[in-house]
C-alpha cells in the first residue's frame, strides 16, 4: 500500500495502487547538502552522484565511534524521500550529494557556505537544466548564510530548506529565515504540526508551507535494502524538493517566484490544526500542506497571488513594519494588522525602484504588521495614487484615472492617533468600483495596474453588529488581490488575505458597544487575467 | 522572511583611523558590523567569515586577507586563511583570535564579519 505521506501529496486523479505520477522530475538535478549517504542503497542506486565535496567539523566527544550506517542515515533517508524507487516523490530526479554534516548530523555555517559556492561554480562550469538545492539543516539566524542563499536563488537556483525542529519562530533560524528560500514545516498523518520529543516543527511567517514530516518511510543506511521511519522538517523539505523537481521537469522555464506561487496554490488549504501553534503565531503561519499539481500543465493562465507578512514593528510610537514581494512579483495591495488595534494604517511606497508595503504603529500600540499581497502579473505596470485627508464630510476618495488601469488594492494611512472617534464612518457610494474610499482624516492609496487582459471587481461583505471576524472570498476563477476594511474605525484590528479570502479582524465584541460603529465591512478586490487564460488556451 | 529579524546579536564596531596607514582606507563614515549567533552553545569563536562589499573582485579579496594576516602578525597574532570565497559572496574564512575583530572590521572593502556557528540536521 502507498505510504501515507505519498498519498497525502498526490492529487486524487493520480491515486492508484501505485504512486506513479507522470514524469518523475527527470530534467531536474537536486543537490543535497547533508551527511554522507549510502549511494548503493537499492532505493537510490544510480540516482545519486556523490560529489567529492566534504566540509564537516570533528565529531563531539571522545567516546564517539564512527559507524558508517549512523553517519549516512540522515542523508540516505532524504535522498530516498526525494527520488527513491519505492518511496520517493520524484522517482526520475537525479541527485548530487555534498557532505556538510558530520556523523552526528552537525555542520557549520562556513561549511554550508562553501558547499553553496561549490554548487554555483559547478553550475557555471557545466550549465544543466533546472537546479533544486535541498538544505535539510538549520542553525541560528545567520546574515551571511541568508545572503549566500539569496545570491544562489538570484542565479536561478531553487532552494528548499527545513523550517527547523525547535518548536519556535522559523525567523530565528537560518537558512529558514532567508526570504528567497522555500521554507518547509512538518505535519503528520492527521495534518497536525509535528511534535518531536519535547519540541517540534517551527512555524511563523518565515515558513512558506508545510509538508509530511512525521513517520516518513525511506531508505535506511543499515543495509542496502533496509527502510526506516524518520521524522523532521528535513523530511518535509525533501517532499517539497521532490514536488519542485516534478514541477520544474514539466515546466523547466518556471522562475523561483512562479514555482513558489504554484506550490502555495496547489497546497491543501486550512487543514492544519492551528491550536498547536502559539496564539500570536497562528495568523502568521501559513495553513498550507504541499501537494503535487493535479496536472503538469495548464496552470499558466491563473493569476497567482500570495500573502507576505512583515516582521513585527516593535512597540515604539513611530515604529513601522515593511513587507516586500520577491523581485519577480508585483505588490498589488497592502494592509496592516495590530493585535491591540492601535495602528495608523499602511501605505505603499517606492523603495529601491520597487513598491513595498509599510505599516505604522500608533501611540500606545504594541506594534503592527504590514501585509503585502504579492502576485505574478506579467507585463504589469502598477502605480500608487494617493489622496490626502479630505477634511470633507464625505471622506477621502481616490480612483484609478489612467486609461486601462484597474484598481487592485486600497490602503489608508492616518496621522491622528485614534481614527473613528471623531466622525462616524463613511461608506462607499455604490457603482464606483474603481475607487478607494476612506475616513476623512486618512490619506488613501489606490494601487492601480495595467496588464494585458487584467480585470478586477470589488466584493463586499458587511455585518451590522460587531463581530470579531468578517470575511469575504473571491469566487472560482478570480484571485484575491486586495483586502481592506470599510470603515477604518478604531475597533478594526486590521485586514489580511488568507488564500482567496479577505479577513477583517475587530476587537473583542464584549469591549465594543453595539453602536453603528460596530458595523464592519470586509472589502475584497478580485482579479483575473483574460490574457493569461487566452495564452494558455493557445498553448494547448 | 527578512534580514532585520530580532533575536540576532549585532555588535557594531565603529571605525577609527589608526596607525595602520591603509592604502585603501574605507570611505569616511561607513561602519562594518560584527555578527554572531544568538544561541550561545552554537557559537564557534575563533573562526570568522569576513564578507566584503558586493563588487569586490577575487584579487581584492585575496589582498584583503593577506593584509589582515600581515597586520595580525605585526601584533603577534597567528591567523590562517581557510577559504577565499568567490562566485556567490566575496570574502574569506579566517581562523584567528577574537582580539583581531576590531582590526579586521577596519580593513578596506569589508561589509561585515560573522562568527562561524553550528548547523544541525533537522
Amino acid at each position: 500500500s502507498i505510504p501515507w505521506n505519498l498519498e497525502r501529496i498526490t492529487p486524487p486523479r493520480y491515486r492508484a495502487d501505485e504512486y506513479q505520477p507522470p514524469d518523475g522530475g527527470s530534467l531536474v538535478e537536486v543537490y543535497l547538502l547533508d551527511t554522507s549517504i549510502q549511494s548503493d542503497h537499492r532505493e537510490i542506486e544510480g540516482r545519486v552522484m556523490v560529489t567529492d565535496f566534504e566540509n564537516v567539523p570533528e565529531e563531539d566527544g571522545t567516546r564517539f565511534h564512527r559507524q558508517a550506517s549512523k553517519c549516512d542515515s540522515h542523508g540516505t533517508h532524504l535522498a530516498g524521500v526525494v527520488s527513491g524507487r519505492d518511496a520517493g516523490v520524484a522517482k526520475g530526479a537525479s541527485m548530487r550529494s555534498l557532505r556538510v554534516l558530520n556523523c552526528q548530523g552537525k555542520g557549520t555555517v562556513s561549511g554550508t557556505l562553501i558547499g553553496l559556492e561549490f554548487i554555483r561554480k559547478s553550475q557555471l562550469v557545466q550549465p544543466v537544466g533546472p537546479l533544486v538545492v535541498l538544505l535539510p539543516l538549520a542553525g541560528g539566524y545567520s546574515r551571511v548564510l541568508n545572503a549566500a542563499c539569496q545570491r544562489l536563488a538570484r542565479a536561478g537556483v531553487v532552494l528548499v530548506t527545513a523550517a527547523g525542529n525547535f518548536r519556535d519562530d522559523a525567523c530565528l533560524y537560518s537558512p529558514a529565515s532567508a526570504p528567497e528560500v522555500i521554507t518547509v514545516g512538518a505535519t503528520n498523518a492527521q495534518d497536525q504540526p509535528v511534535t518531536l520529543g519535547t519540541l517540534g516543527t517551527n512555524f511563523g511567517r518565515c515558513v512558506d508551507l508545510f509538508a509530511p514530516g512525521e513517520d516518513i518511510i525511506g531508505a535506511s543506511s543499515d543495509c542496502s535494502t533496509c527502510f526506516v521511519s524518520q521524522s523532521g522538517t528535513s523530511q518535509a523539505a525533501a517532499h517539497v524538493a521532490g514536488i519542485a523537481a516534478m514541477m520544474l521537469s514539466a515546466e523547466p522555464e518556471l522562475t523561483l517566484a512562479e514555482l513558489r506561487q504554484r506550490l502555495i496554490h496547489f497546497s491543501a488549504k486550512d487543514v492544519i490544526n492551528e491550536a498547536w501553534f502559539p496564539e500570536d503565531q497562528r495568523v502568521l503561519t501559513p495553513n498550507l500542506v504541499a501537494a503535487l499539481p493535479p496536472s503538469t500543465h495548464g496552470a499558466g493562465w491563473q493569476l497567482f497571488c500570495r500573502t507576505v507578512w512583515s516582521a513585527h514593528s516593535g512597540p515604539t510610537r513611530m515604529a513601522t513594519a515593511v513587507a516586500r514581494c520577491a523581485p519577480d512579483e508585483e505588490l498589488l495591495s497592502c494592509s496592516s494588522f495590530s493585535r491591540s488595534g492601535k495602528r495608523r494604517g499602511e501605505r505603499m511606497e517606492a523603495q529601491g525602484g520597487k513598491l513595498v508595503c509599510r505599516a505604522h504603529n500608533a501611540f500606545g500600540g504594541e506594534g503592527v504588521y504590514a501585509i503585502a499581497r504579492c502576485c505574478l502579473l506579467p507585463q504589469a505596470n502598477c502605480s500608487v495614487h494617493t489622496a490626502p485627508p479630505a477634511e470633507a464630510s464625505m471622506g477621502t476618495r481616490v480612483h484609478c484615472h489612467q486609461q486601462g488601469h484597474v484598481l487592485t488594492g486600497c490602503s489608508s494611512h492616518w496621522e491622528v492617533e485614534d481614527l473613528g472617534t471623531h466622525k462616524p464612518p463613511v461608506l462607499r457610494p455604490r457603482g464606483q468600483p474603481n475607487q478607494c474610499v476612506g475616513h476623512r482624516e486618512a490619506s488613501i492609496h489606490a494601487s492601480c495596474c495595467h496588464a494585458p487582459g487584467l480585470e478586477c471587481k470589488v466584493k463586499e461583505h458587511g455585518i451590522p453588529a460587531p463581530q470579531e471576524q468578517v470575511t469575504v472570498a473571491c469566487e472560482e476563477g478570480w484571485t484575491l488581490t486586495g483586502c481592506s476594511a470599510l470603515p477604518g474605525t478604531s475597533h478594526v484590528l486590521g485586514a489580511y488575505a488568507v488564500d482567496n479570502t479577505c479577513v477583517v479582524r475587530s476587537r473583542d465584541v464584549s469591549t465594543t458597544g453595539s453602536t453603528s460603529e460596530g458595523a464592519v465591512t470586509a472589502v475584497a478586490i478580485c482579479c483575473r487575467s483574460r490574457h493569461l487564460a487566452q495564452a494558455s488556451q493557445e498553448l494547448q | 522572511q527578512e534580514d532585520e529579524d530580532g533575536d540576532y546579536e549585532e555588535l557594531v564596531l565603529a571605525l577609527r583611523s589608526e596607525e595602520d596607514g591603509l592604502a585603501e582606507a574605507p570611505e569616511h563614515g561607513t561602519t562594518a558590523t560584527f555578527h554572531r549567533c544568538a544561541k550561545d552553545p552554537w557559537r564557534l569563536p575563533g573562526t570568522y567569515v569576513v564578507v566584503l562589499k558586493e563588487e569586490t573582485h577575487l584579487s581584492q579579496s585575496e589582498r584583503t586577507a593577506r593584509r589582515l594576516q600581515a597586520q595580525a602578525a605585526r601584533r603577534g597574532y597567528l591567523t590562517k586563511i581557510l577559504h577565499v570565497f568567490h562566485g556567490l559572496l566575496p570574502g574569506f574564512l579566517v581562523k584567528m583570535s577574537g582580539d583581531l575583530l576590531e582590526l579586521a572590521l577596519k580593513l578596506p572593502h569589508v561589509d561585515y564579519i560573522e562568527e562561524d556557528s553550528s548547523v544541525f540536521a533537522q
Epitope: 500500500s1 505510504p3 563531539d60 549512523k70 542515515s73 540522515h74 519505492d86 518511496a87 552526528q104 548530523g105 552537525k106 525542529n165 518531536l196 520529543g197 519540541l199 512525521e214 513517520d215 516518513i216 518511510i217 535506511s220 543499515d222 543495509c223 535494502t225 533496509c226 527502510f227 526506516v228 521511519s229 524518520q230 521524522s231 523532521g232 528535513s234 | 553550528s118 544541525f120 540536521a121 533537522q122
Partner: antibody, heavy 130, light 107 residues
Framework: EVQLVESGGGLVQPGGSLRLSCAAS????????MSWVRQAPGKGLEWVAN????????YYVDSVKGRFTISRDIAKNSLYLQMNSLRAEDTAVYYC???????????????????????WGQGTTVTVSS | DIQMTQSPSTLSASVGDRVTITCRAS??????LAWYQQKPGKAPKLLIY???SLESGVPSRFSGSGSGTEFTLTISSLQPDDFATYYC?????????FGQGTKLEIK
Amino acid sequence: EVQLVESGGGLVQPGGSLRLSCAASGITFSSYWMSWVRQAPGKGLEWVANIKQDGSEKYYVDSVKGRFTISRDIAKNSLYLQMNSLRAEDTAVYYCARDRGTYYYQQGSYNYYYYGMDVWGQGTTVTVSS
Amino acid sequence: DIQMTQSPSTLSASVGDRVTITCRASQSISSWLAWYQQKPGKAPKLLIYKASSLESGVPSRFSGSGSGTEFTLTISSLQPDDFATYYCQQYNSYSYTFGQGTKLEIK
C-alpha cells in the same frame, strides 16, 4: 493496508521446539521494529521479544532469554520466533505486532520516538503439554 | 525491570458514564506509555501513545494523561462498543512491559 499473519503454532511436548512465522505485506514491514507478544489463557498480555529493522538488535523478556530467538527476513517480509526448550508456562496465543516508532535528529543527537504496537496479527496458539 | 500496575482490575459502568483507569509505573518512564483495548478472541488495538496522543481512527472520547509514574486513560462517555479489557504498556530502551489489565464490564 498492512497485514500481519502468524502461523506455526500447535501442540508440542515440554522441552520441544516450535518456529512461529509472521508474514507481512509492503515496504512498511521492513521500516519498523517488530515484536512478539503472548497471552496465556485467561491472562494478560506479555511482551516476549523485539527486533530492529535490519535484525542487528534484539531484546527479550527475562523468562525466554537463551531459549527463544527472534529473527526476520527482509527479502521475504517475514518475522520469526524460534522457540526451544518449551515449558508449560509458554502456552499462550502468540501475536506478532509492528512497533511503530520513528527516528529524528535534534541538535546533533539521533533520537527514537515510540508510538506503540499499531498493527497486530490475529494470533497463533502454542500449547505445551505432555 | 519496570513493573506496571493497573487499577482497578475490574470496573463496572453504564453507557454514558465517564470512566477512568489508572496505571502506575515502578519508576519514571517519562511519557513513554501506550494504552490498548482488547475484546475477547481478538488482537489488542492501540488507542493512545506517548501517554496522551490519540491514535488515528480512535474516537475522541478516549483520552490519556500523565507523565513520570502516574497515568490515566479516560473514556468521557461510555459507548456499548467500549466494554472490553484495557492494558497500559511502557516502553523503556527497547524492552516493554504491560499492566495486568482492567476489565470494563456493563453494570
